[in-house]
């Protein structure tokens, strides 16, 4: 099961998600997704990291953390109970069937 | 081309207050966490304050906080830094600076301004 | 609160090279961010996220970062690399922007 995050209505949410880089600076790409994660790639793209930086993000979704350093933490300003529900953070790692996968449900009260 | 334009520095008596602006073009500036760093005559850099793309998270250094208030008005690509109560050691030149982006707090400084220089003095 | 410790001055000969340290504590686990700074000019970004350089800025500029040092290291300098330089990290326990003291670089002869 998911683990579950709470936020209210009109403040940040924060859903936590990290990984350890193989080597300072050598990064895997990340995706951000809402809905559960699927079995390649993030369904609906929030945020997307590539092997150097942040390359695709939509409003209110952003990267919290130093995720330079693995930490890949999303934040969504502002929300609506229309953000509830589950969401994907995919950790790219070359090779098949290698990615790491947390599904996060975060509830809006 | 990234183009970040400070106004409202002046000389301001001890208690006093000043408001100062950062018009920015060139870039989707909502998208983007913005700060102000200052720096005092012949000293180092020091950040001041900080606020979210959207406004809706700000942040301060210590030596500032409950004094000066940032804002930021996105519909003008406008930056704004509110100071009062004005000390000496607030002398400084004050630049605006544009955050990284993707990231919640601009995690260091892309572009800067040219700076405005605020003088309190009696 | 990290403090970030830098040499008040360093000097090298033309064609040398120029390294200039930022200590911290652990500043390993934090992504530090290099800037340049002439006299009567605002500061410029040379390297982010430790090892990465913006464009425009010269190959001769790098960037490394590990334990409690990160180093700017300038290759092959020119008169023209004469300036201030500052290291900066983003303290995330304090939502606070930290820089370091600043070291001036001065290119002999």
């Known amino acids: 099961s998911e683990v579950e995050y709470r936020a209210e209505v009109g403040q940040n949410a924060y859903l936590p998600c990290f990984y350890t880089p193989a080597a300072p600076g050598n990064l895997v790409p990340v995706c951000w997704g809402k809905g559960a994660c699927p079995v390649f790639e993030c369904g609906n793209v929030v945020l997307r990291t590539d092997e150097r930086d942040v390359n695709y993000w939509t409003s209110r979704y952003w990267l919290n953390g130093d995720f330079r350093k693995g930490d890949v933490s999303l934040t969504i300003e502002n929300v609506t109970l229309a953000d509830s529900g589950i969401y994907c953070c995919r950790i790219q790692i070359p090779g098949i069937m290698n990615d790491e996968k947390f599904n996060l449900k975060l509830v809006i009260k | 081309e990234v183009q970040l334009l400070e106004s409202g520095g002046g000389l301001v008596q001890p208690g006093g207050s000043l408001r100062l602006s950062c018009a920015a073009s060139?870039?989707?500036?909502?998208?983007?966490?913005m700060s102000w760093v200052r720096q005092a005559p012949g000293k180092g850099l020091e950040w001041v304050s900080a606020?979210?793309?959207?406004?809706?998270?700000?942040y301060y250094a210590d030596s500032v906080k409950g004094r000066f208030t940032i804002s930021r008005d996105n519909s003008k690509n406008t930056l704004y830094l509110q100071m009062n109560s004005l000390r000496a050691e607030d002398t400084a030149v004050y630049y605006c600076?544009?955050?990284?982006?993707?990231?919640?707090?601009?995690?260091?400084?892309?572009?800067w301004g040219r700076g405005t220089l605020v003088t309190v003095s009696s | 609160q990290t403090v970030l410790t830098q040499p008040p001055s360093v000097s090298v000969a033309p064609g040398k090279t120029a390294s200039i340290s930022c200590g911290g504590d652990n500043i390993g686990g934090k992504s530090v961010h290099w800037y340049q700074q002439k006299p009567g000019q605002a500061p410029v970004l040379v390297i982010y996220?430790?090892?990465d350089r913006p464009s425009g800025i010269p190959q001769r500029f790098s960037g490394s970062n590990s334990g409690n040092t990160a180093t700017l290291t300038i290759h092959r300098v020119e008169a023209g690399d004469e300036a201030d330089y500052y290291c900066q990290v983003l303290d995330r326990r304090s939502d606070h922007w930290l820089f370091g003291g600043g070291t001036k670089l001065t290119v002999l002869g």
């Open positions: 996220y430790d090892s």
């Open positions: 060139g870039f989707t500036f909502s998208s983007y966490a």
């Open positions: 606020i979210s793309g959207s406004g809706g998270s700000t």
């Open positions: 600076a544009r955050g990284s982006y993707g990231t919640y707090y601009g995690n260091y400084f892309e572009y």
